[in-house]
């Protein structure tokens, strides 16, 4: 017998559906109506046939009372080919729900987004996370998605994006967005970061995460942030292969005084990079390849410095050489 596609936990809190059959029984998902956290994975299915069964252009207000009764606050939808019209139909209906956090992962959005809706409402999300989502509309996808969301979005995460740069001219400012996470876009790079951080569109950013994004130097990131007018309090550059030295011909970049926390862990650094902010509350240099203790004049004025997992702290380890078996880091790294 095939396992049930949907499982609801004993507390009616979390419900996970894995639809892997070629012709799944979608009605199984109804057992998730009482859940607060819902995950639906569609096994890579093409949801185009759904459009034949539902009227994506129907007035969503007819479902308002039903949708308001749902407990769902966090929804994850993954592994499917979704027509843009169907996605928009779902967002319009969910605008009447209590949904606060939406995650879309491993999705291929096909077709074009319908025009701006007549009704002025939108989905009141606080968090939107996208991972490996491709859009047929190319660079304009973010602007088009904004048409169905309210402007109070607080957290935006975009990973493994096929087009991490946006059409800045079309994107509206995110006035409430305090956390932007562009991690896991290894092809982004510093030039891509400049294109993604549309000037004046992210005025409230406090936390910016750029893990594994192909960044090369802290100074290059500083320049991209300055160009975009983005002044985060906290910046995560971990898991990038950073160079410690700065191109002498590159102009010196002044970090924003708002920045008080910088994460440079797992960055392959053999020395403390040049051009760091003069003053920081937190600096994380853990799990790098520092083979000697940094000198005070190499470091910013810092309250909380983390150096764990560097070779100079591990007795009997030297700086690892290319091809050597010695990793030069403590096991935690």
């Amino acid at each position: 017998t095939t396992p049930e596609p949907c499982e609801l936990d004993d507390e009616d809190f979390r419900c996970v559906c894995n639809f892997s059959e070629p012709q799944p029984d979608w009605s199984e998902a109804f057992q998730c109506v009482s859940a607060v956290e819902v995950e639906i994975h569609a096994g890579g299915l093409n949801l185009e046939p759904f459009l034949k069964r539902v009227d994506a252009d129907a007035d969503p207000r007819q479902y308002a009372d039903t949708v308001k009764a749902l407990r769902v606050r966090r929804l994850t939808v993954g592994a499917a080919q979704v027509p843009a019209q169907l996605l928009v139909g779902a967002l319009r209906v969910l605008a009447y729900s209590r949904l606060k956090e939406l995650t879309l992962e491993d999705l291929k959005i096909t077709g074009t987004m319908p025009p701006l809706p007549l009704e002025a409402t939108g989905l009141a999300l606080s968090s939107l996370r996208l991972r490996n989502v491709s859009w047929a509309t190319g660079r304009s996808w973010l602007a088009e998605l904004q048409q169905w969301l309210k402007p109070g979005l607080k957290v935006l995460s975009i990973a493994q994006a096929h087009s991490p740069a946006f059409s800045c001219e079309q994107v509206r400012a995110f006035p409430a967005l305090t956390s932007l996470d562009l991690s896991d876009n290894p092809g982004l790079g510093e030039r891509g970061l400049m294109a993604a951080l549309c000037p004046h569109k992210f005025p409230a950013i406090q936390n910016l995460a750029l893990r594994n994004t192909g960044m090369e130097t802290p100074t290059g990131v500083c320049a991209a942030l300055a160009a975009a007018g983005v002044q985060p309090h906290s910046l995560d550059l971990s898991h990038n292969s950073l160079r410690a030295t700065v191109n002498p011909s590159a102009p010196r970049c002044m970090w924003s005084s708002a920045l008080n926390s910088l994460n440079l862990s797992f960055a392959g650094l053999e020395q403390v990079p040049k051009g760091l902010p003069a003053k920081l509350r937190v600096l994380d240099l853990s799990c790098n390849r520092l083979n000697r203790a940094p000198q005070p004049d190499e470091l910013p004025e810092v309250d909380n410095l983390t150096l764990d997992g560097n070779p100079f702290l591990v007795p009997g380890t030297a700086l690892p050489h290319e091809g050597s078996m010695n990793s030069g880091v403590v096991p935690a790294c």
Epitope: L116, P117, A120, T121, G122, A124, Q146, K150, G152, A173
Partner: antibody, heavy 115, light 101 residues
Framework: ESGPGLVAPSQSLSITCTVS????????ISWIRQPPGKGLEWLGV???????NYNSAFMSRLSITKDNSESQVFLKMNGLQTDDTGIYYC??????????????WGQGTTLTVSS | QTPSSLSASLGDRVTISCRAS??????LNWYQQPGGTVKVLIYY??RLHSGVPSRFSGSGSGTDYSLTISNLEQEDFATYFC?????????FGGGTKLEIK
Amino acid sequence: ESGPGLVAPSQSLSITCTVSGFSLTNYDISWIRQPPGKGLEWLGVIWTSGGTNYNSAFMSRLSITKDNSESQVFLKMNGLQTDDTGIYYCVRGDGNFYLYNFDYWGQGTTLTVSS
Amino acid sequence: QTPSSLSASLGDRVTISCRASQDIKNYLNWYQQPGGTVKVLIYYTSRLHSGVPSRFSGSGSGTDYSLTISNLEQEDFATYFCQRGDTLPWTFGGGTKLEIK
């Protein structure tokens, strides 16, 4: 809205806005004021997510908070001067990033700043 | 916002204008204040809010926008404000007081 009516200069203002018929988790609330015989001035907003944005002209002395479960939004403004006199409106904001507008306005609470 | 005041008769057609300092890409709303309270009439330049009579219409683009009321009725005599919604802080025009002639 419910507020004090009369406040002395340099004192602070606290107004509570209690909403009904909708949830503060689905709608933003802005505070907008109108000095006597003048136009409308936007003070700040508290978003569905709880984040806030303020008009930079009031940033240093304005605070907007809310209690979703009690359906209440609170405005606190310090260092009042006579030119802060006016009607203070609690206003619901609705719409997506493109079609945003102030679709429901409270009746307003009148503030007079005078010694 | 122009004019600051305007006199008209029942049945007239009137137009109120609003000019922005830069292109605001149609992010302009219009509000009516008959006495104390305020209500939205038009959002995104030309979209009529639900319940607003069709004698109200909005138009414009770039920096120039207008509100037109055709066939004025008694309850239309009020103060009208435009509001730009392109960027924070949201700002309002100075208002146009429409009075009965």
